[in-house]
Interface confidence: medium
């Protein structure tokens, strides 16, 4: 790993995966196990992230890149680079300090994470409730009562047909 001396910073020629070793007169030494340097010219290697406990390894640490973690089943990532794992709840629940709690009446959560959100207020758009909301699903708003008068026609275009066996991307 010895490299030719540059006239500028003597460390600039050390590639990723090495560090400019102060203790060895600034030769490029390989990063030791469980450490990495992702850019060239570094004077130190960074300690690899360890995916322990509720974290599991998504990508192993290498000499040039840090490990990447995700969460074990029943948990989901929060924060940049999955810095935290938060417990999953069922649909129709939200996570509180005391654990998973059912959504209050008038709110719903259609995911395993996040908070319960209020049902849509159809009347604000001059519409009526077509399908009632549940803890897991929002209400479905329908046409306003006026639109339901005899002779009124729906202006909603038909949904495009899908090929059988294909799920939406």
């Amino acid at each position: 790993f010895e490299r030719t001396r540059s006239l500028q910073d003597p460390c600039s020629n050390c590639p990723a995966g090495t560090f400019c070793d102060n203790n060895r007169n600034q030769i490029c030494s390989p990063c030791p196990p469980n450490s990495f340097s992702s850019a060239g010219g570094q004077r130190t290697c960074d300690i690899c992230r360890q995916c322990k406990g509720v974290f599991r390894t998504r990508k192993e640490c290498s000499s040039t890149s840090n490990a990447e973690c995700d969460c074990t089943p029943g948990f989901h990532c929060l924060g940049a680079g999955c810095s935290m794992c938060e417990q999953d709840c069922k649909q129709g629940q939200e996570l509180t300090k005391k654990g998973c709690k059912d959504c209050c009446f008038g709110t719903f959560n259609d995911q395993k994470r996040g908070i319960c959100r209020p049902w849509t207020n159809c009347s604000l758009d001059g519409k009526s409730v077509l399908v009632n909301g549940t803890k897991e699903r929002d209400v479905v708003c329908g046409p306003s009562p006026a639109d339901l008068s005899p002779g009124a026609s729906s202006v909603t275009p038909p949904a495009p047909a899908r090929e059988p066996g294909h799920s939406p991307q």
């Epitope: 560090f19 070793d21 102060n22 203790n23 030791p32 004077r43 130190t44 300690i47």
Partner: antibody, heavy 122, light 107 residues
Framework: QVQLQQPGAELVRPGASVKLSCKAS????????INWVRQRPGQGLEWIGN????????NYNQKFKDKASLTVDKSSNTAYMQLSSPTSEDSAVYYC???????????????WGQGTSVTVSS | NIVMTQSPKSMSMSVGERVTLSCKAS??????VSWYQQKPEQSPKLLIY???NRYPGVPDRFTGSGSATDFTLTISSLQAEDLADYHC?????????FGGGTNLEIK
Amino acid sequence: QVQLQQPGAELVRPGASVKLSCKASGYTFTTYWINWVRQRPGQGLEWIGNIYPSDSYTNYNQKFKDKASLTVDKSSNTAYMQLSSPTSEDSAVYYCAREAGDGTHYYAIDYWGQGTSVTVSS
Amino acid sequence: NIVMTQSPKSMSMSVGERVTLSCKASENVGTYVSWYQQKPEQSPKLLIYGASNRYPGVPDRFTGSGSATDFTLTISSLQAEDLADYHCGQGYSYLRTFGGGTNLEIK
């Protein structure tokens, strides 16, 4: 846990060389630098040199180049510093201390021995 | 060799006061500066590494700052147990050097 064990004191006759020991435990001895540091009474810290046990690579402070010689015995996880031709000027506490060898802690010394008090006197 | 100069040589402060210790390098050492605390009759202990990183277990009243040639150790609220000598050292050059130390007394 990491420990660096040093004898508490050494009484040395002027001119008679002395070999100070530093026994390491609680970590992989070969992958951390061992530094030696001198502290005279009421004074600051003076870096003598360091050694990498894996291959016995050494660095010395020029001031101590002819005074101190650093060695290791990997089989017993022990580092040694031999002081040659000691005079009263060499009376001091001598510390061995561990330093991470990969720069991850910016070459800081993270563990220190208790120090050996060397008295050079006839 | 890189020379590290600490100031003041000694100081006497009261419990609860904010304390600032200075360390100057004779040339640019980046952030490769450590601070050590040495209590009477004890060996030094690492407080700060990389100029500003607090070593695990060190109380958060100790803060390091600075880069290049000027470095500072701050104790936000002095405690009686902080009576000690404080040393800075550089690891930028493979020839390590330490400052002369600052002796901190409690009034």
